[in-house]
């Protein structure tokens, strides 16, 4: 992979340990927490990033209405189980044998149960709605310029193919970015929308995962775009299964 050969670091993931012990003395990087080898020419999977984050010292850490089946990540951080490809395992459990099923972005999609809980398959999150509120500005941003700037960002910074950015909506001060990627659309080598959304979320929070790159400096025709709140909704190919008790809470 194309980890920087001269100083052997991973440009796309600072939460790695790299050494020139790959074939032919090439730089090889492994994710913290899991020790799995990562491809530094692309984004690291969210599962490996969460695992690395949990292993790190604690101080290192026209608008669309989301559908009734949209999930928000209310559970926050946990130490996930990842499969050999770095994807989330469909069933996640904590140290007290409480288990639950997750989708492809690692968000819980069932009630919590015990070790007998079955999660037959990893359900794909095919639609992500990123809901942003920007800080007050003198005037509204030009919609087309804002739209293009965000699309450029996802292409250039996160290497997400433009076909997966379905829409950018803007009603000042709310911006919504819709990412869509069905299983059938995702080719080998394509960045996953869940990974792109996670990198973006961390960038927005000022917690960039990139090595040796400046933090995110979003500008629209030179005007700074400063985000003051972010909400991310996840829509799965199969609706989540929660009890009525949770839905009425």
């Amino acid at each position: 992979h194309t980890a920087a050969q001269d100083n052997c670091t991973c440009p796309t993931n600072k939460m790695t340990v790299c050494s020139p012990d790959g074939p032919g003395g090439r730089c090889q990087c492994r994710a913290l927490g899991s020790g799995m080898a990562v491809d530094c020419s692309t984004l690291t999977s969210k599962c490996l990033l969460l695992k690395a984050r949990m292993s790190a010292p604690k101080n290192a850490r026209t608008l669309v209405r989301p559908s009734e089946h949209a999930l928000v990540d209310n559970d926050g951080l946990y130490d996930p189980d990842c499969d050999p490809e770095g994807r989330f395992k469909a069933r996640q459990c904590n140290q007290t044998s409480v288990c639950w099923c997750v989708n492809s972005v690692g968000v819980r999609r069932t009630d919590k149960g015990d070790l007998s809980l079955r999660c037959d398959e990893l359900v794909r999150t095919h639609h992500i709605l990123i809901d942003l509120r920007h800080r007050p500005t003198a005037g509204a941003f030009n919609h087309s310029d804002l739209d293009a700037e965000l699309r450029r960002l996802f292409r250039e910074r996160y290497r997400l193919h433009p076909k997966f950015v379905a829409a950018v909506h803007y009603e000042q001060p709310t911006i919504q970015i819709e990412l869509r990627q069905n299983t059938s659309q995702k080719a080998a080598g394509d960045v996953d929308i869940g990974d792109a959304a996670y990198y973006f979320e961390r960038d927005i929070k000022g917690e960039s995962l990139f090595q040796g790159r400046g933090g995110l400096d979003l500008r629209v025709r030179g005007e700074p775009l400063q985000v003051e709140r972010t909400l991310i909704y996840y829509l799965d190919e199969i609706p989540p299964k929660f009890s009525m008790k949770r839905l009425t809470a």
Epitope: T2, A4, Q5, S41, S144, D147, A148, E149, R151, R152, R155, E156, R157, R159, L160, H161, P162, K163, V165, A167, V168, V191, R213, G214, R219, R221
Partner: antibody, heavy 117, light 106 residues
Amino acid sequence: EVQLVQSGPEVKKPGASVKVSCKASGFTFTDYVIGWVRQAPGQGLEWIGEIYLGSGTIYYAEKFKGRVTMTADTSTSTAYMELSSLRSEDTAVYYCARGSIFPFDYWGQGTLVTVSS
Amino acid sequence: DIQLTQSPSSLSASVGDRVTITCRASSSVSYMYWYQQKPGKAPKLLIYDTSTLASGVPSRFSGSGSGTDFTLTISSLQPEDFATYYCQQWSSYPYTFGQGTKLEIK
């Protein structure tokens, strides 16, 4: 095979408009971006702007705002770039280029636009 | 706008020579792209993401650098390498190119 085939050379008078076409084949048109770049005789490359073919989102370089219009016809997989109020400095070869996770991966053969009275 | 300055603007070299072209950005960029252009032809993508060779590009070409300083190196010039080379960034709008480096036969 990915191909971008541009329209033929044009000779225009100052003040007129020119519309250059770029017909795409070998890929799903609406999945990509078409950028436009020009090159004056003996000079370097200058970016004009780009259009996202799936959404119609457009970004023009400040220098060309107000004079350039980019459009696309998805039924014929053709992108267009129209430049108005032409002046002699606009004499150049105009290229279309496909964008993906790269800014430009495939280029058209170029269209020479000559502005002369 | 991010300005890209290439040096040298032109250079004469012989077949078999090692050649280095530099590109300096006026502010930090994530990656650099390099294109090769031959007279009367469209530019061709040579190197992307600073150091990765585009499909079909010979291994004598290499790219390196980070931040504001980037280089394109041709380890052993071949007759077909005499052309003009451009660096380009897209870390922010507008996308910009270097002024070009014309590589001529000595």
